[in-house]
Amino acid sequence: MMTGTIETTGNISAEKGGSIILQCHLSSTTAQVTQVNWEQQDQLLAICNADLGWHISPSFKDRVAPGPGLGLTLQSLTVNDTGEYFCIYHTYPDGTYTGRIFLEVLESSVAEHGARFQIP
């Protein structure tokens, strides 16, 4: 029976040109984590294998840094990076746990866009 739960950073925003840390945490299970995959839509960003360490996909090599921990750092953000990101925990014997993060990349500083979020 799968008893674990994934906590994520949830919905986050960052500035164009900046960087952001995507973080997930698996709790409430004693299952062994064998591998964590990070994905954006149908593109694999990175794999962190418990034995072998990190593999960064060739398409993201210059913009993705491993860590901290099992998290992932996205750098040089563009508006096209806006979207859903998934952390997939492969565990034994439980199976697979998936966490979702939504990232919004803003054109310029959050301060300048403050009005967008104000109630009229």
Epitope: N37, L52, H55
Partner: antibody, heavy 119, light 107 residues
Framework: DVQLQESGPGLVKPSQSLSLTCTVT?????????WNWIRQFPGNRLEWMGY???????RYNPSLKSRISITRDTSKNQFFLQLSFVTTEDTATYYC????????????WGQGTSVIVSS | DIVMTQSHKFMFTSVGDRVSITCKAS??????VAWYQQKPGQSPKLLIH???YRYTGVPDRFTGRGSGTDFTFTINSVQAEDLAVYYC?????????FGGGTKLEIK
Amino acid sequence: DVQLQESGPGLVKPSQSLSLTCTVTGYSITSDYAWNWIRQFPGNRLEWMGYISYSGAPRYNPSLKSRISITRDTSKNQFFLQLSFVTTEDTATYYCASLGTDYYAMDYWGQGTSVIVSS
Amino acid sequence: DIVMTQSHKFMFTSVGDRVSITCKASQHVSNAVAWYQQKPGQSPKLLIHSASYRYTGVPDRFTGRGSGTDFTFTINSVQAEDLAVYYCQQYYSLPWTFGGGTKLEIK
């Protein structure tokens, strides 16, 4: 260049253990990579059996978990496969291969060694 | 385990033709797929990783594409030396698994 070479007996009796050696030249097995065993059955089907990581951690295919052991001798730059309680179903060509985290695919392979299980 | 299915065991082609080999995963594997070529009497050789990236030294007539569950490996302008068995393999999750292979034969 990385080179891998399998060696071991070509004939094993049913219920006995199969033992193979992979000798690696041109790269230290403690530096990086996963050092894998893969077998190819008659009819061409390929099966990943398991690996030992550069740090010495083994990982096995669950279908073989109770019968397989992968170990290494770092002084000889070799890693080993032991498969116990073999049956005729274990007749195959056995390959050792390396997997690097740059590509996450088997980029160097040995030439393979044929093992027949028969009494 | 993830099952990788190559629906064609054999494909027949002529020198100079373009040929595409398909591979279907039983569940989502993102783009964590590699393709290998195995010539008669030889060990497999890595051609493509990350679904679409050619390995070092692989001629550009070999291409790969796909993500999710459906993958295609294409040889543009087949050469006589391309006669071989081609395998897909997923590395999305352990245990790593291979397709059953597609044998390319020259008409």
